[in-house]
């Protein structure tokens, strides 16, 4: 496609799906796309949905029953049954003693842990937020496939400059036939040119990414 | 008949280690508590490490903690005592005792003893 | 640790003399939950092991004689031979067994005249 067709031009019976990539961003915002027609009916992507959201369920009761069981094979070796039988008094005071300072043990150990996981929320969040902070400095546009003729798009996007560059495309028109293969080459040229002129190549970079 | 039969004691050097067993018949082993107690060649009686019945829980005196380790057997109906960095005044008759039912107190069966000599 | 202190260190009686024997513990073995004194005597003849005669202070072992008879509660103990046999020559020892470690007196030598 030649890329400077208005609104009035006939479409095409079924064009082929354009693949969404910058460099072929004028084509993309100027071809017209037949909506594709959705093959699954609404109740059979209800009941899909509702079928996904079983599985992930069952999936998540999984994981939690496995968590449950560590818990347990966890508990089961640190914490054995307690064998009193035969134990004299002064055993189970003794024991008692070991206990109470394994809890004490414990309880520091369970303290530095605490201290660490609030530790490492905290820099999480601060992450999570520089990322996001990051993301408002970038922000991507949300692309909207709108019919915009070719003339209209460089206006919007050069301003000024959009004469100078219509111009050099009237010419670039009016080149014969037999050249074809030398003003693809040097509509690519000028291509290149505009993109550098407007930032473009930062923006394209970003959008194939 | 309650029986505990030691065994495993003899002569060792300071420094040297040795391993005591104390085979145990005529009761319900793994549901008792199992002590070591010792008698010093001036008939004074020590106290050195109690194992419970499931080997969950023990006790040693200052004495020999560190030094020497108690254990059990429960499916062989054994007790196990490890002496390592032996000193002279380990030099004692090594008995195995059984501890009384869980209401009641003391050692109520002794074995006959095994000699440990730590000597150079 | 409790230290256990017996007197005297030896005694020599007759045949059917009645005899008295002392342990003391450097502290209370009374346990106030259940009123139990946690001491217990042994018996030791010669070339044997010792042999547990009295628990809890009081409570004879089952197939010790009734001539011997524990008292006493917190620190102060004694062990009475009501009438002395010859089979009970023996040295006669106390333990404690209050708390850990578990500590025995140094014992009394029962002697025959």
């Known amino acids: 496609a030649d890329g400077s067709s208005d609104a009035a031009r006939e479409p095409r019976p079924a064009p082929a799906p354009i693949r969404r990539r910058s460099s072929n961003y004028r084509a993309y915002a100027t071809e017209p796309h037949a909506k594709k027609k959705s093959k699954i009916s609404a109740s059979r992507k209800l009941q899909l949905k509702t079928l996904l959201l079983q599985i992930a369920k069952q999936e998540l009761e999984r994981e939690a029953e496995e968590r449950r069981g560590e818990k347990g094979r966890a508990l089961s070796t640190r914490c054995q049954p307690l064998e009193l039988a035969g134990l004299g008094f002064a055993e189970l005071q003794d024991l008692c003693r070991q206990l109470h300072a394994r809890v004490d043990k414990v309880d520091e150990e369970r303290y530095d842990i605490e201290a660490k996981v609030t530790k490492n929320i905290t820099e999480i969040a601060d992450l999570t937020q520089k990322i996001f902070d990051l993301r408002g400095k970038f922000k991507r546009p949300t692309l909207r496939r709108v019919r915009i003729s070719a003339d209209a798009m460089m206006q919007a996007l050069l301003g000024a400059r959009a004469k100078e560059s219509l111009d050099l495309r009237a010419h670039l028109k009016q080149v014969k036939k037999e050249d074809t293969e030398k003003e693809n080459r040097e509509v690519g040229d000028w291509r290149k040119n505009i993109d550098a002129l407007s930032g473009m190549e930062g923006r394209k970079k970003k959008f194939e990414s | 008949e309650v029986k505990l039969e030691e065994s495993g004691g003899g002569l060792v050097k300071p420094g040297g280690t040795l391993k005591l067993s104390c085979a145990a018949s005529?009761?319900?082993?793994?549901?008792?508590?199992m002590s070591w107690v010792r008698q010093t060649p001036e008939k004074r009686l020590d106290w050195v490490a109690t194992i419970s019945s499931g080997g969950s829980y023990i006790f040693y005196p200052d004495s020999v903690k560190g030094r020497f380790t108690i254990s059990r057997d429960n499916a062989r109906n054994t007790l196990y005592l490890q002496m390592n960095s032996l000193r002279s005044e380990d030099t004692a008759m090594y008995y195995c005792?059984?501890?009384?039912?869980?209401?009641?107190?003391?050692?109520?069966?002794w074995g006959q003893g095994t000699l440990v000599t730590v000597s150079a | 640790d409790i230290v256990m202190t017996q007197s005297p260190s030896s005694l020599a009686m007759s045949v059917g003399q009645k005899v008295t024997m002392s342990c003391k513990s450097s502290?209370?073995?009374?346990?106030?939950?259940?009123?139990?004194?946690?001491l217990a005597w042994y018996q030791q003849k010669p070339g044997q092991s010792p042999k547990l005669l009295v628990y809890?202070?009081?409570t004879r072992e089952s197939g010790v004689p009734r001539r011997f008879r524990g008292r006493g509660r917190g620190t102060r103990f004694t062990l009475t031979i009501s009438s002395v046999q010859a089979e009970d020559l023996a040295d006669y020892f106390c333990q404690q067994h209050y708390s850990t470690p578990l500590t025995f007196g140094a014992g009394t030598k029962l002697e025959l005249k």
């Open positions: 809890f202070a009081s």
């Open positions: 502290q209370s073995l009374l346990n106030s939950s259940n009123q139990k004194n946690y």
């Open positions: 005529g009761f319900t082993f793994s549901s008792y508590a």
């Open positions: 005792a059984r501890h009384h039912n869980p209401d009641k107190s003391g050692f109520a069966y």
